[in-house]
Amino acid sequence: ERLCHPCPWEWTFFQGNCYFMSNSQRNWHDSITACKEVGAQLVVIKSAEEQNFLQLQSSRSNRFTWMGLSDLNQEGTWQWVDGSPLLPSFKQYWNRGEPNNVGEEDCAEFSGNGWNDDKCNLAKFWICKKSAASCSRDEEQFLSPAPATPNPPPA
């Protein structure tokens, strides 16, 4: 019996997308690269439901985790890695007093019950996101794919 696996092994399915929560740590730019290497993107949050889901994943594991949000292009103007701006209705997710840009903090992370800005060169866990596969169109997607784990072997 063939089973539909909309996401690669070790990825989590939520509302039509697949998410990979890393088990190793990288800086923000290397986290972007790690996601690209597996055909994904450092997570861009598109809805309140998605935010709640991801925040829960991060807080449960008690990890500081990079998301695809920074103000590297222009200080104080937060932009997602897909080029879209941070909308005002999403600014509610910043932790109290954040973003504060203390010491050039230009990249956003999941921290506790909200978001925090931190230095982009710090190594943290990260979350990749890509669209889930549609099992009805392509038979190969009924097969369980080999693990796609964007974690480099230890140096």
Partner: antibody
Amino acid sequence: QVTLRESGPALVKPTQTLTLTCTFSGFSLSTGGMCVSWIRQPPGKALEWLALIDWDDDKYYSTSLKTRLTISKDTSKNQLVLTMTNMDPVDTATYYCARAHSGSYFDFWGQGTLVTVSS
Amino acid sequence: DIQMTQSPSTLSASVGDRVTITCRASQRISNWLAWYQQKPGKAPKLLIYKASSLESGVPSRFSGSGSGTEFTLTISSLQPDDFATYYCQQFNSYWTFGQGTKVEIK
């Protein structure tokens, strides 16, 4: 109480630039969560969102009109200005400014100002 | 951009009728939806925000429900003052209005 009032020319010629002002009271655009937006409505048609500015001075524009729009605020005067370049007869509409609660829904609206584009 | 589709475009009803207007989003918007009422020559008036929260001062005969992509505005017992055009609006990704539903006298 919260009030908003739009002002600007009633008639604009094609290719000209439209400048509209929204004067508001009862809240401050420097307060966290406060946003003001411009929305228009051609005669007999639906509402169309144009632009929004928030308490951080971040600006957001309609994808289809962003090359023609500029939104700015003067917090000390409690005023908002929208400029729209290269006006065309299809831009004839009632233009509203409205407060957006935390950048979400529009809880207070001005009465609107009708702008006609004609030569 | 997210598209909002309202149905029906026009609705004929009588005083006392239960009226339901539907709004569909082209992608999931959680509960980030508002409903407005507009009368001719007037600015829109907020009725419902976050899909189901009643704005202060709005009569309790108005209610909203839904989440994700499907939403409804219900008027439990239509009153003479309710004949107007109703718009839904999403605020999950930028801001988009539906095309409107005109509620007219049957």
